[in-house]
Structures are given as C-alpha cells and as structure tokens.
Interface confidence: medium
C-alpha cells in the first residue's frame, strides 16, 4: 500500500500548516539542543508563540535552570484520499533528569485509547532523550477527519503539541437527496439534493429520465423547481467534486390521477332489510382515498330504476346497506374518490334480501272461556301479508296472566294452518291478556292488539267472549 503524502493546501494554510514531505515527519533531531522559549507561529510570523511550552524547575544540583520544553513543530495539515494509509508524529527532546514521561494522542479534544496504532520510540543521548510518538491509520475513512495533538505530562505540567489536521477526501456523500413524491398534474414542486466532500466544492447536476436538467452545475445544496409534469418521471441528482461523482438513487415522481374502480365486491350477509358488502380498493391513483359511494339499484321490472347512494368512509372496505325491502333483488356497485376525483364504478353484483317478518298482525282475535274444559279458546283471521314477508309458517300466541299483583307471560307456537287455539287456564280469579303475531321465515310480525278476558273463581261462569274487532268493524 502506498504511503499517503500531504498535498499542497487548496485555499491557504490552516493554523500550523506546513507543506512538508513525510520524510520530515519521521526525521530525528540531529542535536541535543533544546527548543527555544521564544518561537514564532508559522501562521502568524513575527508573533511570539509560547502555547505549548513547559518551564521546568531548577535541577537537583540547584544551580542550572533548564530551558523550556516543547514539541518540535511538524506537519500541520495532511490531505489524503479515503482508504489510504497515513502516518504522522510528534517529537520532543526531554532532559534525562525527567523519568516516566508518557505521550498520549488526542483527537478533537478526546483521548485516543485502545486499538490505535500509536508507537513511542526513545532515543537517549548524554543529556537528553529524543522521544518520537508516531500515529498511523490504515485505510483512512471520513470519520478519521480531525485535529490530532500529542500531550505529555512532566512534573505535573502538561505540554501540548501543535495540531495536525487530517483531511480525508473522497467522493461526494449525500446528506439530503430527492424523495419520491406524488404530485398534481402540471403543478410545480421542489426536489432537494445536498452532498458534502471533502473535497469541496460539491456541484450538483439534476437528471430527469436519464437526461440532464441543468447545463450549469449548482453548488450544493441545490433545490430543483420542476414547473409541472404530465407523466411519471424519474429524477436523480449527481454530486461532483474533484474526486469523482456520486449519483443518488433515482426517485419516481408520480402524477396523481383518479383511482381505479374497486374490485371484488362481495356479499357477506343478507337480512330482510340490509346487505353487508365488502370490496377490494382499486389503485389509489397516487393520492389517498377520501371516501366511497355504494350505489344500489332495485332489479325489478316494475321499479322506477332509481339508484340509492350511500356514502361511507374509504376504510374499512365494508358497508352495511340498510333500509332495503325484504325478498328483493338489488344490483350493487362501489366507487371511491381521492383528491382528484371519483373512480369508475366497480363491476355490478347481484344480491338479494331475505324474507321479511310479516308487517301486519292477525285479525279479529276473539277469546272466550270454556270453563268445562278449564281452558281459553282463541280464534283469529289470517293476516293479509305481502309477498316480501314470505310464506307463513305459524303464529305466536302471547298470554299474560295477572292476579293480585302477580303477572306471568307464556308463549305458544302453532302451525300455519290453524286459525284457532286453546290454552289451559293458568290462574283463576285472574285476567288473561292475549296477543297473536304471524310468523314467517323472515321473523315474527307485530302482535295484535291485546284482548283481555277475566277468569273467575271456580263455579262462576261467564260465557261472553272478548274480541278485537276486524279493521273497519269498529
């Protein structure tokens, strides 16, 4: 693997920058001399620089004052490509009177601990020891960008080196890129693309359906205003820097349209007056469904062909159609809408309601007491039921017995061929209230008006019947 070389700086030097070859990074001090106390910063010539100097105390001999300690200046800025290796160092000459000197590496204010390739070498001489701390990174990444310094503790004093700036360069990296959108036809919208280096600048080109949109690049970030589309398009952006170009993922911009019609309209449950349906929504036309409309037509040559419309929410994809006639055939279709408009109606399906319960009560209900048999005779006339109520299957008789604050109801079922019934007397000295309802497969119809008869104590007979008048006889 090649060793990365620091390149000349682009705009101008950063603080402490030197355009140096790597050879100088690794060179050892040739003399055992000390760094002078007064130094000049490479960035501000002529200004005294004393930032990283430590003033040692008097030696054990008590006579000789040692010069200040400081790291030797090294390269200030290293620029290299991603995945290259880099090595840099700090060097300092320390009088031999100091023991246990350790150098630590710091990056952007945090100490670098653990699995880093840091090596410290010692080169002792008669009076001083030259210490070189090397730091190497293999296959650098953008995350290695930053300011590296050496720190050394000596006599409770901290000596800090000048920073070495590492700038890792690579292809542009997207921080913001266009996102898929659903837009209204011929309506303007914006797409945003942002990418960063280093190296900067990063220039943006926009591509629509594989063709360049802008002939001149725009500096990142870039906002593309599209005046409007009439058909779906794919947009991507290209980010260019001096290392190459990166192409973003292509994003599809869809044109909102009316939805496709729902499909698979299904019947889940039918009663005499309601039908529960469900449907599978069609394609939403790139715009959320707002609501749906259930359209119901009665399939009957005699009907006037009018359409009942029931509006419902788009979700769940289910609706209970109510207020229907019993034992009737209907044609049902569903349409849904989004912000653009209504879909066509789904394929129509046929559905039927079931038999209804009778809508009228039996007529001319009469009740009289047959004391010899200790029962009550009940008679009635078959009601005039409509076809939709279905076939009569029988009658339901309700008789309520009330005596001295006690009340109990009993129900009897009789067949459809009957128009009379007998019930046993349950309680004497009591009132019996009778009501009758017709029954079909569709259910139980309304009960007739109540007819009351008094059941006397044993031996007191009144044969007079009680009855409900037939309509029109009152």
């Amino acid at each position: 693997r090649e060793e990365a070389k620091p390149y000349p700086l682009f705009p101008g030097p950063l603080p402490g920058s030197l355009q140096t070859d790597h050879t100088s990074l690794l060179s050892l001090p040739h003399t055992s001399g000390y760094q002078p106390a007064l130094m000049f910063s490479p960035t501000q010539p002529g200004r005294p620089y004393t930032g990283n100097v430590a003033i040692p105390r008097v030696t054990s001999a008590g006579s000789k004052l040692l010069p200040p300690l400081a790291f030797k200046h090294t390269v200030g800025h290293i620029i290299l490509s991603e995945h290259k290796d880099v090595k840099f160092n700090c060097s300092i000459s320390v009088p031999n009177i100091y023991q246990d000197t350790t150098i630590s590496w710091w990056k952007d204010g945090k100490e670098l601990l653990g699995a880093h390739h840091a090596i410290t070498q010692f080169y002792p001489d008669d009076e001083v020891t030259a210490i070189i701390a090397s730091f190497s990174i293999t296959s650098v990444q953008r995350s290695d960008n930053g300011s590296y310094i050496c720190k050394m503790k000596i006599n409770n004093e901290e000596i800090v080196s000048d920073p070495i700036y590492i700038e890792v360069q690579g292809l542009p990296h997207f921080t913001k890129q266009p996102e898929s959108m659903n837009v209204t036809r011929n309506t303007a919208f914006n797409l945003t693309c942002q990418a960063v280096g280093p190296p900067e600048p990063v220039n943006i080109f926009w591509v629509q359906n594989s063709s360049r949109v802008n002939e001149q690049p725009e500096k990142s970030p870039s906002v593309l205003t599209v005046p409007g589309l009439t058909e779906m398009a794919v947009f991507s952006c290209e980010a260019h820097n001096d290392k190459g170009l990166t192409v973003s993922k292509g994003v599809q911009i869809n044109i909102k349209a009316i939805p496709s019609p729902p499909t698979e309209v299904s019947i889940h449950n039918s009663t005499a007056h309601s039908i529960l349906i469900s449907w599978v929504p069609g394609f939403d036309g790139y715009s959320p469904f707002r609501n749906c409309s259930v359209q119901v037509k009665e399939v009957d040559p005699l009907s006037n062909g009018s359409v009942m419309i029931f509006n419902t929410s788009a979700s769940p994809h289910m609706y209970q159609i109510k207020q229907l006639q019993a034992l009737a055939n209907y044609s049902i279709g569903v349409s849904c809408m989004n912000e653009i408009g209504w879909s066509a109606v789904s394929p129509w399906i046929l559905a039927s309601t079931t038999e209804g319960a009778p809508s009228v009560a039996p007529l001319n209900v009469t009740v009289f007491l047959n004391e010899s048999r200790d029962n009550v005779d009940i008679r009635w006339m078959k009601p005039l039921t409509k076809r939709q109520a279905g076939e009569l299957v029988g009658y339901r008789i309700s008789h309520v017995w009330q005596s001295a604050g006690i009340s109990k109801e009993l129900l009897e079922e009789v067949g459809q061929n009957n128009s009379r019934a007998q019930i046993s007397v349950q309680v004497h000295n009591a009132t019996c209230t009778v009501r009758i309802a017709a029954v079909t497969k569709g259910g139980v119809g309304p009960f007739s008006d109540p007819v009351k008869i008094f059941i006397p104590a044993h031996g007191w007979v009144d044969h007079a019947p009680s009855s409900t008048p037939a309509p029109g006889n009152a």
Epitope: G170, F174, S211
Partner: antibody, heavy 128, light 111 residues
Framework: QELVESGGGLVQAGESLKLSCKAS????????ISWVRQAPGKGLEWIAY????????NYAHSVKGRFTISSDNAQNTVFLQMPSLTASDTATYFC??????????????????????WGPGTLVTVSS | DPVLTQTPSSVEAAVGGTVTIKCQAS??????LAWYQQKPGQPPKLLIY???TLASGVSSRFKGSGSGTEFTLTISDLECADAATYYC?????????????FGGGTEVVVK
C-alpha cells in the same frame, strides 16, 4: 481481479461485431466499465461507459446512436454491439474499470473519473 | 468541451535523468487529471490520479502536479523500463452525459 475482452476479428465494412468484456474477481455491480479504443499507432479514445448496477450508460459523440453498450450482470459481462462498421473503427478495443471506491453506500453509483484496471484488448479490423 | 494537449510529443533522456511531460487543458478541470503509461502491445497502466495521487503499487519516482489548466508529470531517476508512451486523461460532464478525454500522448525514449 481481471478483465478479458473477446469478440474481435476481421470483418468487412458494413458488417457487425459484438465485443464482450468478462470480469472476474470484481463486485461487478459496484463499478463503471468503459470501452476505450486505440487505432494502430494512434492515441486512446474513450467510446462508451456503463454502470451495470445502476443502468447508467454513456457514449462518446463519435459512436452515439450507432454503438450500444449493455451488460449481463449474472454473467459479469459487458458487451459492445457495433453495427455498420467502417474502416475508421479499426482499432484495439480495451475495456477498463473505474478506480476502486470502497467507501460507498449501497444503492448509489460512484464514478471515480479514472481507469485502474484494463483488459489486454481485442483487435477489430474492418476492411473496405 | 475540454481538450488536453500534451507536450512534447516525444522526449529522449538518459538513464538516471529526469523527464517532464506537460498536459494543458483548454478549460479548468480543477485536479481531475490522471496519467497513464502504455508500453507497446499492452494496455495502459494508471500512474497518477487526482493530479498528484500516486496509484497503488506505482514507484514514487513518478510525480504529478498542477491544477486548473496546467499539469505536469515528472519521472526522476529514469530507468530503461520507463520507456513508453504517457497519456494524460480527464473527465467532464455527468454520469449520463459525461466524457473521458485523453491527451495525444508523449513518447519517452530512454538512452
């Protein structure tokens, strides 16, 4: 990692050829592949580019609308379809791969401007 | 569209010497420039990219410099194996509308 071209040969003017560039030891979809030609005793001329994993294609003005670059990602092969050849198309045709860029994110195309890996070339001779 | 002009078209130098090849772009290409070496019967070999970055496995005797419109390839401590034709190359445009451009080449003869 290597690229090997094939499909060259001697053809008459007006005939067609289809060149192949087979890549091995390369994550085929993560690189751009170009065709570069060199007429006998002349310099290098880039003619077409494809980024197989992204469907990006690109042509030099001299061949745009005439040559077609394509790829078979399953076979790790790039093709150059050359119909209606003329004597000026006589050259050694090289395929070349973009410079390594392993710092990428899946789903993006990275074009690094330079060619780091070349095939040995295949000679196309068009006689008039 | 940028045009790359290489000078000289041919240069002769002795073993151990230094050769300098220039590449001039007709418009600024920043540092988007590569140098290739091609020996007869062989494909080109990438030497330098991004104007000054040494490609992997290439001797440090090859040095690239320059930016904008003026670029230089310097070969020091010339060896017999350096006898070849050298091409500069750039790229301009986008992913679907970009072009690679080569210079006309410089032949290096080593005595």
């Amino acid at each position: 990692q290597e690229l090997v071209e094939s499909g060259g040969g001697l053809v008459q003017a007006g005939e067609s050829l289809k060149l192949s560039c087979k890549a091995s030891g390369i994550d085929f979809s993560s690189y751009g592949i170009s065709w570069v030609r060199q007429a006998p005793g002349k310099g290098l001329e880039w003619i077409a580019y494809i980024y197989p994993g992204f469907g990006i294609t690109n042509y030099a003005h001299s061949v745009k609308g005439r040559f077609t670059i394509s790829s078979d990602n399953a076979q790790n092969t790039v093709f150059l379809q050359m119909p209606s050849l003329t004597a000026s198309d006589t050259a050694t045709y090289f395929c070349a791969r973009d410079l390594d860029y392993t710092g990428g994110v899946v789903g993006y195309a990275y074009v690094t401007y330079y060619f780091t890996l070349w095939g040995p070339g295949t000679l196309v001779t068009v006689s008039s | 569209d940028p045009v790359l002009t290489q000078t000289p078209s041919s240069v002769e130098a002795a073993v151990g010497g230094t050769v300098t090849i220039k590449c001039q772009a007709s418009e600024s290409i920043s540092s988007r420039l590569a140098w290739y070496q091609q020996k007869p019967g062989q494909p080109p070999k990438l030497l330098i990219y991004s104007a000054s970055t040494l490609a992997s496995g290439v001797s440090s005797r090859f040095k690239g410099s320059g930016s904008g419109t003026e670029f230089t390839l310097t070969i020091s401590d010339l060896e017999c194996a350096d006898a070849a034709t050298y091409y500069c190359q750039t790229y301009y445009g986008g992913s679907t509308t970009g072009w690679y451009v080569f210079g006309g080449g410089t032949e290096v003869v080593v005595k």
